[in-house]
Interface confidence: low
Amino acid sequence: ESALITQQDLAPQQRAAPQQKRSSPSEGLCPPGHHISEDGRDCISCKYGQDYSTHWNDLLFCLRCTRCDSGEVELSPCTTTRNTVCQCEEGTFREEDSPEMCRKCRTGCPRGMVKVGDCTPWSDIECVHKESGTKHSGEVPAVEETVTSSPGTPASPCSLSG
């Protein structure tokens, strides 16, 4: 868990419902899947599908489960001990320095560039400058063809992803 837990990370405070399991804290901490009661005497289980905690903790509330955005697919649901795992839909990616949204992958490389890496949920296609000796279509050259540039004539990447 991050030591910095803001109000929006927390599920709304709710009184312990009768079905919520309780146990005693160990050295002041509650196990994953639980949070501590206000009086510090009990560990109260998180609510499956609603909130979770991943580590031993002294949180007054479990953390609220993430909801996958439109444009994302749910790889695994939220459990009491693990947050939802979301992934960008096919044909889109989440860029490292703008992780808040999935962006559409480009369908091809600009003129004069060739694709060397695919669209994945984590990266746009990767493009590099075409060098002498490569085919003039947008395709990656065949197996026997080699780009013969030196480091001084770099195939600069055009991909926006890292």
Epitope: G117, T120, V140, P141, V143, T146, V147, P154, A155, P157
Partner: antibody, heavy 115, light 101 residues
């Protein structure tokens, strides 16, 4: 978690050959370009070769004609066949993910070329 | 071949001090990558495409530049920042070794 694990380094005589391997895990290997970068003792980083997710390859002038990069996507493994080795090829060889903007690196394997 | 020259080769800074290191290319390039390397470990991507800060890198790091001149800046030096930093396009510069005072 992305992991790159190089192997195959060692001591070899000038003119000899060595084949390095890099076992990749934690990402869709076949979707990414891969590269080899080396670092001579106390020196900077020298790009050696890159291979696209297809078959396009690129080599530094210093190794062209002597080194061959290849990959086996079914085994999630990158290779570097090094022939006609010279003393100046002595370095730690790193396997790196992507063509040029290397976002993950292996721990490296040491190649020493000496008689 | 494009040569990258880093300066200074070695520098030291006190905690809290602003640090700037530079990388000059022998001819104009369109972007620069920076890697951090600590002794006995492999390099880590630190800044890419001139100014994008890699995941997990503290916010105090930034990159800038264009053409033949690029720089990496630490707004407030911390002990954990002591390392060698390499600028790179294909091959790299010789590195700037940053030490803590």
């Amino acid at each position: 978690e992305v992991q790159l694990l190089e192997s195959g380094g060692g001591l070899v005589q000038p003119g000899g050959s060595l084949k390095l391997s890099c076992a990749a895990s934690g990402f869709t290997f076949s979707s990414y370009a891969m590269s080899w970068v080396r670092q001579a003792p106390g020196k900077g980083l020298e790009w050696v070769s890159s291979i696209a997710n297809g078959k396009m390859t690129q080599y530094a002038d210093s190794v062209k004609g002597r080194f061959t990069i290849s990959r086996d996507n079914s085994k999630n493994t990158l290779y570097l066949q090094m022939n006609s080795l010279r003393a100046e090829d002595t370095a730690v060889y790193y396997c790196a993910k992507r063509w040029n903007r290397f976002d993950y690196w292996g721990q490296g394997t040491l190649v020493i070329v000496s008689s | 071949d494009i040569q990258l020259t880093q300066s200074p080769a070695i520098m030291s800074a006190s905690p809290g001090e602003k640090v700037t290191m530079t990388c000059r290319a022998s001819s104009s390039v369109s972007y620069m990558n920076w890697y951090q390397q600590k002794s006995g470990t492999s390099p880590k991507r630190w800044i890419y495409d001139t100014s994008k800060v890699a995941s997990g890198v503290p916010y105090r790091f930034s990159g800038s530049g264009s053409g033949t001149s690029y720089s990496l800046t630490i707004s407030s030096m911390e002990a954990e920042d002591a390392a060698t930093y390499y600028c790179q396009q294909w091959s790299s510069g010789q590195g700037t070794k940053l030490e803590i005072k």
